[in-house]
Amino acid sequence: KSSNEATNITPKHNMKAFLDELKAENIKKFLYNFTQIPHLAGTEQNFQLAKQIQSQWKEFGLDSVELAHYDVLLSYPNKTHPNYISIINEDGNEIFNTSLFEPPPPGYENVSDIVPPFSAFSPQGMPEGDLVYVNYARTEDFFKLERDMKINCSGKIVIARYGKVFRGNKVKNAQLAGAKGVILYSDPADYFAPGVKSYPDGWNLPGGGVQRGNILNLNGAGDPLTPGYPANEYAYRRGIAEAVGLPSIPVHPIGYYDAQKLLEKMGGSAPPDSSWRGSLKVPYNVGPGFTGNFSTQKVKMHIHSTNEVTRIYNVIGTLRGAVEPDRYVILGGHRDSWVFGGIDPQSGAAVVHEIVRSFGTLKKEGWRPRRTILFASWDAEEFGLLGSTEWAEENSRLLQERGVAYINADSSIEGNYTLRVDCTPLMYSLVHNLTKELKSPDEGFEGKSLYESWTKKSPSPEFSGMPRISKLGSGNDFEVFFQRLGIASGRARYTKNWETNKFSGYPLYHSVYETYELVEKFYDPMFKYHLTVAQVRGGMVFELANSIVLPFDCRDYAVVLRKYADKIYSISMKHPQEMKTYSVSFDSLFSAVKNFTEIASKFSERLQDFDKSNPIVLRMMNDQLMFLERAFIDPLGLPDRPFYRHVIYAPSSHNKYAGESFPGIYDALFDIESKVDPSKAWGEVKRQIYVAAFTVQAAAETLSEVA
């Protein structure tokens, strides 16, 4: 049979049929179903939801749906010994205590098992001391404190506002600065958009709302006790002292009402500039310690959380491919939530559920995709991407040989302004072509394409008439697939207007107020943005699984490689004297990029011309496309980050959420002027240029004619 016959692609069973089957009303119904109780990783409630999803995916028509369980390190507050922070007087009496839980949202007062706000994996401890305000606790904030202001955080408790960077990086920075505790808080400047009411009357964060979250620095390791290997029944587990990425000092999050009580008493140095001031009616003094009347008062943390090895459950559904069943296109998103998960993750899980239902409907009518589609409902994402990472570790040999693409499906919305896409350059053309075929849900763009509204609202900074597509960073379940295994990956969601809303994430992120009502009342009453995201995610999966030739364009990689090489070269050229002294040259990298560009161009020409009816040649060309992303993997990994193996992209060492290009070179150059041994430091820069140039050249050669 021809490949068309095998996949039964008829007018009834094309992408349009799949997209037309997706319904906003179903997504709404699924979201409601998934958000009525908390589904914290490792709890009975989340296990029951896993079994419900398994059952429903089977009903929808998938070939098989299995639970994959692992026993991983999780973290929970002590139910009888709550975490809190006190202001204590000179006699040690607690004169103020931070809240023990968030005020429950209306209608949820009697819901049990709402985990109180905590920083997952904080060690236990009761440190007391003077407070130092460290702004966002970014690398540059500590540089400002230590180098410019000569403020020493050693032995202090630091208070940092959430936002800008991943909270784990904040904690790591505080540890390196010698702090003995960290208080994280949400400032209204970052989590309260002007002119919008706070929940339950709007989508802003109320003063009692608190952002939960893990504070690990795993660098892609997965379960802290079994790095590199699955946490299965016969796993060898490290001792807790050798666990990967655990913080060493107590950490606790609070809301802005509590933060006000701590910050209003701060004395010491004034804030260095306006960028250190939030929106509270406090001076934002840096400290250390309290002012005047309150100078004898101290801050004391009371943290009693425990780390426990706990069973988690992924749901893995399979829709077998008709022609290339050994080629996997994966759609995955997590199921576990901090509380109700109204946005994170269930707005994504509801979309996945509807995509599965639509694919199942087509399959029941006799259709199959060309390639196998795997659907995943990951567990314990909130505790460090654990479910996805353990599954990928268990199946790494299959995935590295058979993995075509991974599409992530966490929160479908973080706003309702326009589309946001982060993906490998291989998928740029796929995303562009797909969004040109989809209708925009945006007001004022009726009858226009999604591509048009997206490009208008979020234009590319480099190419006019094109939309912005960002680099993949981390902080979500694509990490192991892209950064460790080198499987082409992408993610899409609806986002806010970054120009007018300067807050970080969405205001109610990881709080108890992330409810169904938040979405249904304030973000997407018609569920039209959810439907659009379902069409983008589902459409990408459909094309990746069904195109005869994989919808990857290697020429787009060539373009970005040149851009990234230019960028890292200009960073290095800020030190012209040292480059001369230590004979630092980027010639090898630029040469490799040039070779890649030429070879990619020739490969694309061959791709247009080859005989697609020859299954051997078709498979050969597709394999070259599939394995291109894999070719950017360095088996030795990045320095001190063995599970970040992609040479072109890695999560920023200063912000896990952000992607950095040529991360090995970037990190070698970072703050190089402060290194005690410049010769050694510039030697490492040269080594990283060598690794990058070699990798780009080696990747280029995978696209050359095979013989």
Epitope: I95, F96, S99, L100, P103, P104, E109, G208, G209, Y257
Partner: antibody, heavy 124, light 110 residues
Framework: EVQLVESGGGVVQPGRSLRLSCAAS????????MHWVRQAPGKGLEWVAV????????YYADSVKGRFTISRDNSKNTLYLQMNSLRVEDTAVYYC?????????????????WGQGTTVTVSS | QSALTQPASVSGSPGQSITISCTGA?????????VSWYQQHPGKAPKLMIY???NRPSGVSNRFSGSKSGNTASLTISGLQAEDEADYYC??????????FGGGTKLTVL
């Protein structure tokens, strides 16, 4: 309708105990700080105690510290004032009142909902 | 925790304006913008009229206004009406995390 209803008042001898209750309805009780305020016959208002929505903070007027205990049961939407070692000067109408700000940590934003009060008479 | 100082009584004719003062210390009124004012009619529960020095809850007439200077807060009632006759109490947050009320002012509308 937002409502606070106090109960438990009565006549009691000095040195004895009494427990006042305040039943809340019509609002999300578990998210509000709550106060007790009293008013002796023919006198002005006197603040007695406050409790945060989650019981993490309790503060008392000096005149009652060590004798009175404020508590709450959010599952029952009820505020309590346990009054021990009562004195003649504790005779008053006792009001419960709601702090204005939901989820507040300050308890000084103003009391926007009041009960009608329950009378406590301490007399030998 | 000594009570804030208010005049025992003030009076005014309908349509006039009156001001009630509330004097404390730097550890209460002067130190924080957390002064509230309450109205109490005989035999009734108090009613919040002003919070955080100068803010009016919804439903309270704009004839009522509040201000503060140093350690003294003030409540002004303009266009006095017969139904304004009542007792008025100020309250303030204090440095010891407690609240303190004023002794109360009886307003008579002549």
């Amino acid at each position: 309708e937002v409502q606070l209803v106090e109960s438990g008042g009565g006549v009691v001898q000095p040195g004895r105990s009494l427990r006042l209750s305040c039943a809340a309805s019509g609002f999300s009780f578990s998210g509000y700080g709550m106060h007790w305020v009293r008013q002796a016959p023919g006198k002005g208002l006197e603040w007695v105690a406050v409790i945060s929505y989650d019981e993490s903070n309790k503060y008392y007027a000096d005149s009652v510290k060590g004798r009175f205990t404020i508590s709450r049961d959010n599952s029952k939407n009820t505020l309590y004032l346990q009054m021990n070692s009562l004195r003649v000067e504790d005779t008053a109408v006792y009001y419960c009142a709601r702090d204005r700000i939901w989820g507040s940590r300050g308890y000084y934003y103003g009391m926007d909902v009041w009960g009608q009060g329950t009378t406590v008479t301490v007399s030998s | 925790q000594s009570a804030l100082t208010q005049p025992a009584s003030v009076s005014g004719s309908p349509g006039q304006s009156i001001t009630i003062s509330c004097t404390g210390a730097s550890s209460d009124v002067g130190g924080y913008n957390y002064v509230s004012w309450y109205q109490q009619h005989p035999g009734k529960a108090p009613k919040l009229m002003i919070y955080e020095v100068s803010n009016r809850p919804s439903g309270v007439s704009n004839r009522f206004s509040g201000s503060k200077s140093g350690n003294t807060a003030s409540l002004t009632i303009s266009g006095l009406q017969a139904e304004d006759e009542a007792d008025y109490y100020c309250s303030s947050y204090t440095i010891t995390s407690t609240l303190v009320f004023g002794g109360g002012t009886k307003l008579t509308v002549l």
